[in-house]
């Protein structure tokens, strides 16, 4: 009989993984995918990947843009793929940013959008991130 | 449009093998994984087996497990089913399924190929 | 293993008039992270692979007519057919995704009175 593979888990998303945490894997599973932008001594730096815990995402995920950072958040297998997160244009508020995906379903409304509005840094995500 | 064309099916007598497979269009196939799900006659379904997008997991319900090999041709785009020590309790109508991007429920279904086994 | 258990078995409704299925699994399948039942509705008509209607307990597959709504949550799901039609006659079957094995209610066939 041949080798038993892992068990698949039918909660974990696959996502599109890109950035120095990826390794050389060009893919990761998680349960939320994301795609972030943040500025790292004045370059742009674009990063895709997953976060593993639903939990690890929900406050990431919840975060509205900054100047120096987005993160865009989303659901369903490869949903990354074509997500390119983008910072807020200079001197315009959003307040009423929706920066969460969900394919085929109801975008978080704007009230969902509170909470703690803490910065995730480019550390944190990769530390979210699945190697 | 979506398509999946089960093949492979037939009479086989117990204990031999039967290789099914399901050629996939309309997708892009090595995005997602695929299913097995059978129907005895008469009766309701069930689940079979998967197979990730890559092969690199793989699973099986209790029934199949150690007969049965799933595997893909990404290149092909077509999923295997190989069935050994077949056993008359196996005789359904097997079809194949593509899972959905949002969990692992079925958007598209074959028409599926029957496997009757008897002697 | 999560076992489905559908009732009733069979059911006659006249034309126009509710349908109500009932589904039951084992254990739950809404998973509290982020809040979705792991449960899907197909309808299968006689000759026919299943089609999917309804996933995450209650959102309606493109293209499903609105005269098919499902509810429930945890252990507890129903799929409703509101004003049913002829074409409506088929086997529905439940099937929760939220572990492996995946595993299917014994199904319901719906017929006319």
């Known amino acids: 009989m041949e080798d038993e593979k892992p068990k698949v888990n039918p909660k974990l998303y696959m996502c599109v993984c890109e950035g120095l945490s990826c390794g050389n894997e060009d893919h990761c599973e998680g349960q939320q995918c994301f795609s972030s932008l943040s500025i790292n001594d004045g370059f742009h730096v674009y990063q895709k990947g997953c976060f593993q815990v639903y939990e690890q995402g929900k406050m990431t995920c919840k975060t509205p843009p900054s100047p120096g950072q987005a993160v865009e958040c989303c659901q369903g297998d490869w949903c990354n793929r074509n997500i390119t997160a983008q910072l807020p244009t200079k001197g315009k508020s959003f307040p009423g940013t929706q920066n969460f995906h969900l394919e085929e379903q109801k975008l978080i409304s704007e009230e969902d959008l509170g909470g703690e509005q803490k910065l995730i840094s480019e550390e944190d995500l990769h530390h979210h991130h699945h190697h | 449009e979506v398509q999946l064309v089960e093949s492979g099916g037939g009479l086989v007598q117990p204990g031999r093998s039967l290789r099914l497979s399901c050629a996939a269009s309309?997708?892009?196939?090595?995005?997602?994984?695929m299913h097995w799900v059978r129907q005895a006659p008469g009766k309701g379904l069930e689940w079979v087996s998967v197979?990730?997008?890559?092969?690199?997991?793989?699973d099986y319900a209790d029934s199949v497990k150690g007969r049965f090999t799933i595997s893909r041709d990404n290149a092909k785009n077509s999923l295997f089913l190989q069935m050994n020590s077949l056993r008359p309790e196996d005789t359904a109508l097997y079809y194949c399924?593509?899972?959905?991007?949002?969990?692992?429920?079925?958007?598209?279904w074959g028409q599926g190929t029957l496997v009757t086994v008897s002697s | 293993d999560i076992v489905m258990t559908q009732s009733p078995d069979s059911l006659a409704v006249s034309l126009g008039e509710r349908a109500t299925i009932n589904c039951k699994s084992s254990?739950?399948?809404?998973?509290?992270?982020?809040?979705?039942?792991?449960l899907a509705w197909y309808q299968q008509k006689p000759g026919q692979p299943p089609k999917l209607l309804i996933y995450?307990?209650?959102t309606r597959e493109s293209g499903v007519p609105d005269r098919f709504s499902g509810s429930g949550s945890g252990t507890d799901f129903t799929l409703t057919i509101s004003s049913l039609q002829a074409e409506d006659v088929a086997v529905y079957y439940c099937?929760?995704?939220?572990?492996?094995?995946?595993?299917f209610g014994g199904g319901t066939k719906v017929e006319i009175k």
């Open positions: 399924a593509k899972k959905n991007s949002l969990g692992w429920f079925f958007d598209y």
């Open positions: 309309g997708f892009t196939f090595d995005d997602y994984g």
């Open positions: 197979i990730s997008w890559n092969s690199a997991t793989i």
């Open positions: 254990q739950s399948v809404l998973y509290s992270s982020n809040d979705n039942n792991y």
């Open positions: 995450w307990a209650s």
């Open positions: 099937q929760q995704y939220y572990s492996t094995p995946l595993t």
